[in-house]
């Protein structure tokens, strides 16, 4: 159950999808990936205020307990709810291969 | 792919399962749950240093980019990898019912 999508902290401050451009060197992939030479990494960044995009019952509990015991229980965290697949052209022992990764690019975000 | 389980920050400091005792009042459930009157909430708490329990490729990317751009990209976050089901005895309009929740108690943790 996705809870409220209204961000009380102001536009763009809450958990949402961001794109970060990264080179193979940035990612530490230069020694095993040939292409793409640059990746538009989509990731989930932002705050998770009370019930904002709560992923499930556990997230709702976490929000309640964080309010009560902020030093013990952290606030929910903005993480991928789903992913977009991406193909990499990889170096192999014998040459090159295509490999599809299903867990590389965030598609959608929620708080948990 | 779960990466290293060794915590470089010291015993118990990294992402792991914790148990937090909470009453129905703490959880805001007193008006709709009859039992249990207290819940041993298992949740994922702790730091996610480089490659510690990295859930997937996305988590590994996040670690790399956090190292490069700590003000832009947050470190991976400690969240449930799976859940244990829990049954609640709920109040209903006509009386009481048993309801099983599959996403309430964390069973296992990883960093993402």
């Amino acid at each position: 159950a996705r809870n409220g999508d209204h961000c009380p902290l102001g536009p763009g401050r809450c958990c949402r999808l961001h794109t970060v451009r990264a080179s193979l060197e940035d990612l530490g992939w230069a020694d095993w990936v040939l292409s793409p030479r640059e990746v538009q990494v989509t990731m989930c960044i932002g705050a998770c205020p009370s019930q904002f995009r709560a992923a499930n019952m556990h997230a709702q509990i976490k929000t309640s307990l964080h309010r009560l015991k902020p030093d013990t229980v952290p606030a929910p965290c903005c993480v991928p709810a789903s992913y977009n697949p991406m193909v990499l052209i990889q170096k192999t022992d014998t040459g090159v291969s295509l490999q599809t990764y299903d867990d590389l690019l965030a598609k959608d975000c929620h708080c948990i | 792919a779960r990466n290293g389980d060794h915590c470089p920050l010291g015993p118990g400091r990294c992402c792991r399962l914790h148990t937090v005792r909470a009453s129905l009042e703490d959880l805001g459930w007193a008006d709709w749950v009859l039992s249990p009157r207290e819940v041993q909430v298992t949740m994922c708490i702790g730091a996610c240093p480089s490659q510690f329990r990295a859930a997937n490729m996305h988590a590994q990317i996040k670690t790399s980019l956090h190292r490069l751009k700590p003000d832009t990209v947050p470190a991976p976050c400690c969240v449930p990898a799976s859940y244990n089901p829990m049954v609640l005895i709920q109040k209903t309009d006509t009386g009481v019912s048993l309801q099983t929740y599959d996403d309430l108690l964390a069973k296992d943790c990883h960093c993402i």
Partner: antibody
Framework: QVTLKESGPGIVQPSQPFRLTCTFS??????????ITWIRQPSGKGLEWLAT???????RYNPSLKSRLTVSKDTSNNQAFLNIITVETADTAIYYC??????????WGQGTLVTVSA | DIVMTQSQKFMSTSVGDRVSVTCKAS??????VAWYQQKSGQSPKALIY???YRNSGVPDRFTGSGSGTDFTLTISNVESEDLAEYFC?????????FGGGTKLEIK
């Protein structure tokens, strides 16, 4: 297993349009880095890149042919399309649809012959 | 557009020999070159990517080399099944372009 198959009209009259269909399997056109490229080869000649339609609809065309080409896709049915308007006899060729993985033409269809003739 | 020149349209070789197919780019393309093999009546098949990396399933007698403007596809210990036309292609800049092809004949 990746497979691609082209289908089209076979014979087209000069100045008429035609449409080729590429039906593929073994991969998804919604995967980042994946595209469908159209390449043609006149009889006994070399290869000419025509256009690529990418997963994110960032379509690319050969500048020398751009005004006559359009590409499109139906991701859910695993199909891609090439439209050429006002064909000329010089458009007679075998047309290949190819799986592009980033900048690599990884897998090729068997090709379909298009003959432009009155 | 970058022109890829395969100066030898035909090359003749014998089974067991070593043969080198060359390709020259009209400007620097780094290592952004691929090679394709096309047997008679068939569609091209990807052999080499990034100048020197063999596609999976390609026998190790096929070797790619070169960078900048000069590229070579070498077939060591030629087999009769290598009778085909070989195309180079640059993908360093848009539009991608192919060489005119080199037909390998087996004596």
């Amino acid at each position: 297993q990746v497979t691609l198959k082209e289908s089209g009209p076979g014979i087209v009259q000069p100045s008429q349009p035609f449409r080729l269909t590429c039906t593929f399997s073994g991969f998804s056109l919604s995967t980042s880095g994946i595209g469908i490229t159209w390449i043609r080869q006149p009889s006994g000649k070399g290869l000419e890149w025509l256009a690529t339609i990418w997963w994110d609809d960032d379509n690319r065309y050969n500048p020398s042919l751009k005004s006559r080409l359009t590409v499109s896709k139906d991701t859910s049915n695993n199909q891609a399309f090439l439209n050429i308007i006002t064909v000329e006899t010089a458009d007679t060729a075998i047309y290949y649809c190819v799986q592009s993985a980033w900048d690599w033409f990884a897998y090729w269809g068997q090709g379909t012959l298009v003959t432009v003739s009155a | 557009d970058i022109v890829m020149t395969q100066s030898q349209k035909f090359m003749s070789t014998s089974v067991g020999d070593r043969v080198s197919v060359t390709c020259k780019a009209s400007q620097n393309v780094g290592t952004n070159v691929a090679w394709y093999q096309q047997k008679s009546g068939q569609s091209p098949k990807a052999l080499i990517y990034s100048a020197s990396y063999r596609n999976s399933g390609v026998p190790d007698r096929f070797t790619g080399s070169g960078s900048g403007t000069d590229f070579t596809l070498t077939i060591s210990n030629v087999e009769s099944e290598d009778l085909a036309e070989y195309f180079c292609q640059q993908y360093n800049s848009h539009p991608v372009t192919f060489g005119g092809g080199t037909k390998l004949e087996i004596k």
